[in-house]
Interface confidence: low
């Protein structure tokens, strides 16, 4: 590259015009603050690129850097970048203007930094000092760059005097910052909302004290964008908070809420994303089955528990055949909700010792203004069975009978059976059924009724034996879902003048 | 666009059973937010709620009724249906499948066209 | 059961005059916990399926013109047309869902006088 005039250093004066040339081998471009100010490019027959910015009516803002690049996309070495430094004394025009964020120096550790206060004019002498004090520093002053040195955390403003009045630049503020890999966390006051309702998020980071927060939000795709108040949680050091509050949520304000966080000292960032969902109302939504029948054993405690879904939190009530239930005193009944998520509960009903009367119709019923969801299911007291009587009679006929009755619920199964040995029976030899219909040595009579009151059936069964010509052991069993019963009998032929 | 379309017989003789089936089309009957009940209404009388089931099985009945009354649900055909066994010359009536919302603030929002049964020997 | 019950049996209006339909319940309808009534109303036409108009007792549903309000609470409500109007020649049924089983008034006739 070659730049005419070469510089590196050019002093011009203030409404004059000045051409500066750039060429090479490849396209150049003269650039400016990181921007291309308008300039002509042009190809020489022998094929080389130039391109001349005329700088017109020059003014002290015109003093500073120049650099003529290649105009490329490719990476390129940096001597193959020219850099022009232009000062243009300009009396009117104090120290050159700084953008915010120059005025405010952040350090990580001790090391030497720059307070960029700068001049239009080579000749001025330039001082630094505190901001409340008039002693000057001694630190070396480059009118290009600034002050250079190791500055504590203070705050300092540069001095000149221009004709025969002292100009004082900006304040700069040096500070030392706490800086760690960045932490971030993103929670929501809520979730789930309903429309017209507000949506509060907040990214927190922990270890820096120094960070950009960037906020991506569904409103902010259509355009609409939302201040986010940045704060700092004082009780914490080195917590920072950004919260984004929109209010009167819209069901397009579903989706997903991103916070993205940035620290420029090393470059570090981290995101967290949290999914916001706007209902057109709330809801109550039952989660999983419950069957329509549930059992409980008499005397056992038994849990019954409903799992759903609900925003805003619902009311939750337990029926028993239409009359509300709450936790008795006498400790029978236990009614408990609980919230295991945001919008997930668990409502439960704990029957302690159940009884028979606790058998009937119930039903839970969740609701809040805008739904409701009631959930109903018979329970079954299940009564393990019992063998309330096992008699043995001779009735005129000659056959021998013996009566079985029990009560159980659900419906008892009886099962006869018999042994001959006597002393065998029943460990060595197992015992033989009885009441199947192709023996025509018993014949059985099962009677079942269905005790409204106590809820249960009683089972009466009759086993007529044809005849008997030795001791017989008979024995009866009943059996249901929840346990069985036996008793047992001694049947001895009619011949023999005694009964064991 | 929701639909409810109620088909079945029109005539059942007495000591029989009844069965309904109600088509939902235009929206899914395995929606969380719905039951779907049935009403009937008995010539020049009134409407009488039937019973109503959500599409996991769970059902409600009347009580006047239920010992009688089934309903269930085909989620696959997206339908559900009723049968009323032992049926009397009581039973003749316009039978409507109708749907509402678990979220109670929609009794019967939709109905079907309502089909007439009539029992007679 | 919620026994509803309806006045009158049947009612004839003018055209354009109001018509005023009462219905009680049995036992109170209002869920104190979010003091509302569990009540509809329900508009029946011959030969077509009932139409949902009111509930939580003054809550008109959706495509149902201005001219038809409810009001009440706890026991006492009442469907009033503002203007009648041909097309609302009809049964109407007062409903309560306050807890199941469901049930429905016996119904009022409107006529045109």
């Known amino acids: 590259l070659v730049v005419t005039p070469p510089g590196p250093e050019l002093v011009l004066n203030v409404s004059s015009t000045f051409v500066l040339t750039c060429s090479g081998s490849a396209p150049v471009v003269w650039e400016r603050m990181s921007q291309e100010p308008p300039q002509e490019m042009a190809k020489a027959q022998d094929g080389t690129f130039s391109s001349v910015l005329t700088l017109t009516n020059l003014t002290g803002l015109d003093t500073g850097e120049y650099f003529c690049t290649h105009n490329d996309s490719r990476g390129l070495e940096t001597d193959e970048r020219k850099r022009l430094y232009i000062f243009v004394p300009d009396p009117t025009v104090g120290f050159l203007p700084n953008d915010a964020e120059e005025l405010f120096i952040f350090l990580t550790e001790i090391t030497e930094i720059t307070i960029p206060c700068r001049v239009t004019d080579p000749q001025l002498v330039v001082t630094l000092h505190e901001k409340k004090g008039d002693v000057a520093l001694p630190v070396p002053y480059d009118h290009q760059r600034g002050f250079s040195g190791i500055f504590e955390d203070r705050s300092y403003i540069c001095k000149t005097t221009i004709g025969d009045r002292e100009v004082d630049s900006d304040a700069y503020y040096v500070y030392r910052l706490q800086v760690s890999s960045i932490n971030v966390s993103v929670n929501a006051v809520q979730t789930v909302v309903r429309q017209g309702e507000n949506i509060t998020l907040m990214c927190i980071v922990i270890g820096n004290e120094v960070v950009n927060f960037e906020w991506t939000y569904p409103r902010k795709e259509s355009g609409r964008l939302v201040e986010p108040v940045t704060d700092f949680l004082l009780d914490m050091p080195y917590h920072i908070r950004s919260i984004l509050h929109i209010p009167s949520a819209e069901l397009e304000d579903s989706g997903t809420y991103t916070c993205n966080v940035t620290e420029s000292v090393n470059d570090h960032q981290d995101e967290k994303a949290i999914n916001i969902t706007v209902v057109e109302s709330g809801y109550v939504r039952l989660l999983g089955e419950v069957g329509t029948l549930q059992f409980a054993e008499l005397h056992r405690s038994r849990t019954l528990q409903v799992v759903f879904e609900a925003y805003p939190p619902p009311t939750v009530l337990w029926f028993k055949d239409n009359r509300t239930l709450g936790d008795s005193s006498a400790g029978e009944i236990a009614l408990s909700t609980r919230n295991v998520s945001e919008t997930r509960y668990v409502s439960e009903l704990t029957l302690v010792r159940v009884k028979v009367a606790e058998a009937g119709h119930y039903t839970m019923r969740a609701f809040h203004e805008d739904a409701e969801v009631q959930l109903s299911f018979q329970l079954q007291i299940n009564v393990p069975v019992r063998v309330l009587e096992l008699s043995e009679s001779h009735p005129d006929s000659g056959e021998q009978t013996v009566r079985c009755r029990g009560r159980g619920m659900p419906q008892p199964n009886i099962i006869w059976s018999a042994c001959r040995d006597l002393k065998r029976c029943p460990r060595e030899l197992p015992p033989t059924l009885l009441g199947n219909s192709s023996e025509e040595e018993s014949q059985l009579e099962t009677n079942v009724t269905y005790w409204e009151e106590e809820q249960e059936f009683e089972v009466v069964s009759t086993l007529r034996l044809q005849h008997v010509d030795r001791p017989l052991s008979v024995r009866c069993t009943l059996r249901n879902a929840v346990g069985q019963d036996t008793q047992e009998v001694i049947v001895v032929p009619h011949s023999l003048p005694f009964k064991v | 666009q929701l639909q409810l379309q109620e088909s079945g017989p029109g005539l059942v003789k007495p000591s029989e059973t009844l069965s309904l089936t109600c088509i939902v089309s235009g929206g899914s009957i395995s929606s969380s937010s719905y039951y779907w009940g049935w009403i009937r209404q008995p010539p020049g009388k009134g409407l009488e709620w039937i019973g109503s089931l959500y599409y996991s099985g769970i059902t409600f009945y009347n009580p006047s009724l239920k010992s009688r009354v089934t309903i269930s649900v085909d989620t696959s055909k997206n339908q559900f249906s009723l049968t009323l066994t032992s049926v009397t010359a009581a039973d003749t009536a316009v039978f409507y499948c109708?749907?509402?919302?678990?979220?109670?603030?929609?009794?019967?929002?939709?109905w079907g066209q309502g089909t007439l049964v009539t029992v007679s020997s | 059961d919620i026994v509803m019950t309806q006045s009158p049996e049947s009612l004839a209006v003018s055209l354009g005059e109001r018509a005023t339909i009462n219905c009680k319940s049995s036992q109170s309808i209002l869920y104190s916990s979010n003091n509302k009534n569990y009540l509809a109303w329900y508009q029946l036409k011959p030969g077509q399926p009932p139409n949902l108009l009111i509930y939580?007792?003054?809550t008109r549903e959706s495509g149902v013109p201005d001219r038809f309000s409810g009001s009440g609470s706890g026991t006492d409500f009442t469907l009033t047309i503002g203007s009648l109007q041909a097309e609302d020649v009809a049964v109407y049924y007062c409903?309560?869902?306050?807890?199941?089983?469901?049930?429905f008034g016996p119904g009022t006739k409107v006529d045109i006088k």
């Open positions: 109708a749907r509402h919302r678990v979220m109670a603030s929609s009794p019967f929002d939709h």
């Open positions: 409903q309560q869902y306050y807890s199941t089983p469901f049930t």
């Open positions: 939580w007792a003054s």
